[in-house]
Interface confidence: medium
């Protein structure tokens, strides 16, 4: 047991050296906030991550930690600084009484404090029969490139590195940060301790049953023998990866996080920082049959979040629970009865299930894509994963009704060829969080830093909304949807695309009040229309119908209700061409769709007219979907007529443009 006299000595010295005015208020009059896990059994009170403001230096972090210890000592409390963070997030990890939180929140430089909490491995050993020899022979699956230029970091349990599947492929780092095992009757058994990590390492890069057979891996131990870890341990692991990357820059890095805990602001922030440093993070959506946005790191937008499906493309059921779902999931991948290395012996195989296995598949696919195209950015990789996925194969009836529209119907697949997709215009749909029901509530959807927002739409289950608009926020366009009085809330839906050298702007026409309705077009030379939005202040637009079809020869025009302001997204990019495609149905229908042809990519999706019985419009892959209220409530009057308007674009010059950029 360690001698803690040193702690007291430091406290005494700190007390003498610090002046009296210790409890000074935080700078700029802002108040630091306290966060803790919403799932009570997962909380770890007594250990806290104190996150300091972004520009705080290491010396300031250390001084702030000492100041906290000094102030605590004056009040008769012992504190212990367990770790000082730098390299990813500034801050420190402290063991202290919860009584001191109020004091800690008032310290200078403090941004927020988060109570530590548990994270868990996301696999279930489905059947434990050993399968020897493995079900798959090495010659049955020969990928075009085995991911040999890529390093995959695995944050998991310990692993059995001498297993035949992964021997020589996985380097076990000296990083270990795990909590004690629970329960007084727990006995550590090496094979159990290594089970989860060994299996996943095999799924990623195993000789016989691996996805990216050429990928090299590094393992960090952040989960104990029961598959349990902490947010703080995971943070320190991510920091270790960042420091390793800085000390010895290698090729592309993929970080696999096959674990999940409750929503954590600090874990999401660390993932964001690492992603912005050029690292691809892949995580399990979680096995809680719940909205993935309630878990971390699954809810971090910069992370590729993977749900699990089975051989029949059904979402995976795991006991009474199953795969998570919702807007925070990027795509699904195989996650049931996955054959992989078993830690029971060096030639044993076992089948496991869970979103951890699904995430391992995607990490393997990502390693192969990056090995073929090492310069791919995170945004480019994500768009390619989505583009090459199998579409609309998942049975959505398994998901709760309100989550079906938000959950991507995509199952990860290897690209037929890892090259030659450069000219393709890639777009994806990003849903916002729900706005909530208050009258002035809004919802915001954002694209990734190196994506362009090409259009913006909105959706409300009640139909009570006030449309949407594109607006600048922090030098970048965002999509904002507006709730209406009596509405249950809205979603904003952004169409986010990869468009190198693009110059995009929004042109707005205020409400026309004229019977012809409101119009706006792209008037700048060389700019093409990529999306239309409309926003209105009145509670109900009424039944006025603008002319549904545009005048011939004016494809660069958005048309809308005379009481609405209309916003046109206009872009200039090398070789970009767009066209408007409409599908109108005279009789009322709950859903109207229009799709872009092969070779064209959907960039914009909107509805005409924007009247109150239209619930909204959104893009699903290359199809524009317009939803209306139940036909039984609208009747069969002309008011029921709805047109889906798609804007389809393509660029044959994208490959050239990306070369010019380099």
């Amino acid at each position: 047991q360690e001698d803690e006299d040193g702690d007291y000595e430091e406290l005494v010295l700190a007390l003498r050296s610090e002046e009296d005015g210790l409890a000074e208020a935080p700078e700029h009059g802002t108040t630091a906030t306290f966060h803790r896990c919403a799932k009570d059994p997962w909380r770890l009170p007594g250990t806290y991550v104190v996150v300091l403001k972004e520009e705080t230096h290491l010396s300031q972090s250390e001084r702030t930690a000492r100041r906290l210890q000094a102030q605590a000592a004056r009040r008769g409390y012992l504190t212990k600084i367990l770790h000082v963070f730098h390299g990813l997030l500034p801050g420190f990890l402290v063991k202290m009484s919860g009584d001191l939180l109020e004091l800690a929140l008032k310290l200078p430089h403090v941004d927020y404090i988060e109570e530590d909490s548990s994270v868990f491995a996301q696999s279930i050993p489905w059947n434990l029969e050993r399968i020897t020899p493995p079900r798959y022979r090495a010659d049955e699956y020969q990928p075009p490139d085995g991911g040999s230029l890529v390093e995959v970091y695995l944050l998991d349990t310990s692993i059995q590195s001498d297993h035949r599947e992964i021997e020589g492929r996985v380097m076990v780092t000296d990083f270990e940060n795990v909590p004690e095992e629970d329960g007084t009757r727990f006995h550590r058994q090496a094979s159990k301790c290594d089970s989860h990590g060994t299996h996943l390492a095999g799924v990623v890069s195993g000789r016989d049953a691996g996805v990216a057979k050429g990928a090299s891996m590094r393992s960090l131990r952040v989960l104990n023998c029961q598959g349990k870890g902490t947010v703080s341990g995971t943070l320190i692991g991510l920091e270790f990866i960042r420091k390793s990357q800085l000390v010895q820059p290698v090729g592309p890095l993929v970080v696999l996080l096959p674990l999940a805990g409750g929503y954590s602001r600090v874990l999401n922030a660390a993932c964001q920082r690492l992603a912005r440093a050029g690292v691809v993070l892949v995580t399990a959506a979680g096995n809680f049959r719940d909205d993935a946005c309630l878990y971390s790191p699954a809810s971090a937008p910069e992370v590729i979040t993977v749900g699990a499906t089975n051989a029949q493309d059904q979402p995976v059921t795991l006991g009474t629970l199953g795969t998570n779902f919702g807007r925070c999931v990027d795509l699904f991948a195989p996650g049931e009865d996955i054959i992989g290395a078993s830690s029971d012996c060096s030639t044993c195989f076992v089948s496991q299930s869970g979103t951890s296995q699904a995430a391992a598949h995607v990490a393997g696919i990502a390693a192969m894509m990056l090995s073929a195209e090492p310069e791919l950015t995170l945004a480019e990789l994500r768009q390619r994963l989505i583009h090459f996925s199998a579409k609309d194969v998942i049975n959505e009836a398994w998901f709760p009704e309100d989550q079906r529209v938000l959950t991507p119907n995509l199952v990860a697949a290897l690209p037929p060829s890892t090259h030659g997709a450069g000219w393709q215009l890639f777009c994806r749909t990003v849903w916002s969080a729900h706005s909530g029901p208050t009258r002035m509530a809004t919802a915001v959807a954002r694209c990734a830093p190196d994506e362009e927002l090409l259009s913006c739409s909105s959706f409300s289950r009640s139909g009570k909304r006030r449309g949407e608009r594109m607006e600048a926020q922090g030098g970048k366009l965002v999509c904002r949807a507006h709730n209406a009085f009596g509405g249950e809330g809205v979603y904003a839906i952004a169409r986010c695309c990869l468009l190198p050298q693009a110059n995009c702007s929004v042109h707005t026409a205020p409400p026309a009040e004229a019977s012809m309705g409101t119009r706006v077009h792209c008037h700048q030379q060389g700019h093409v229309l990529t999306g239309c939005s409309s926003h209105w202040e009145v509670e109900d637009l009424g039944t006025h119908k603008p002319p549904v079809l545009r005048p011939r020869g004016q494809p660069n025009q958005c048309v809308g209700h005379r009481e609405a302001s209309i916003h046109a997204s206009c872009c200039h990019a090398p070789g970009l061409e767009c066209k408007v495609k409409e599908h109108g149905i005279p009789a009322p229908q709950e859903q109207v769709t229009v799709a872009c042809e092969e070779g064209w990519t959907l960039t914009g999706c909107s509805a005409l007219p924007g009247t109150s019985h239209v619930l909204g419009a959104y893009a699903v892959d290359n199809t524009c979907v317009v939803r209306s209220r139940d036909v039984s409530t609208t009747g069969s009057t002309s008011e029921g007529a709805v047109t889906a308007v798609a804007i389809c674009c393509r660029s044959r010059h994208l490959a050239q443009a990306s070369q010019e950029l380099q």
Epitope: Q1, P45, R75, G76, L78, G98
Partner: nanobody, 126 residues
Framework: QVKLEESGGGLVQAGGSLRLSCAAS????????LGWFRQAPGKLPEFVAA????????YYADSVKGRDTISKDHTKNAVDLQMNSLKPEDSATYYC???????????????????WGQGTQVTVSS
Amino acid sequence: QVKLEESGGGLVQAGGSLRLSCAASGRTPRHYILGWFRQAPGKLPEFVAAVREPGSSTYYADSVKGRDTISKDHTKNAVDLQMNSLKPEDSATYYCAVDPYPTPEFTTHVGHYDYWGQGTQVTVSS
């Protein structure tokens, strides 16, 4: 350094009582939780009871609830564990331990307790 010393152990008949005492010396923080644990041969330590200082609120394991009482003896700077209706399965080495970073909830996990005494043996014969 916090130093802990247990006393009061011994041999007792089933149904009998014992009073264990834990004396703390050295630099004890003002805020802490003192817990009693027991360890039978070949088994891991098991939480018995704890008291929080200041405030003297208490918490018990289900196995001893209603039979044991933990209390602070301020005159001796000690924490006593009064054990009644003893059973043979109560036989173990009893340790007192201090968690110097008390959380709002009582913690029963051995890993949270940083300072430990040497232990005192309790044997309950049938």
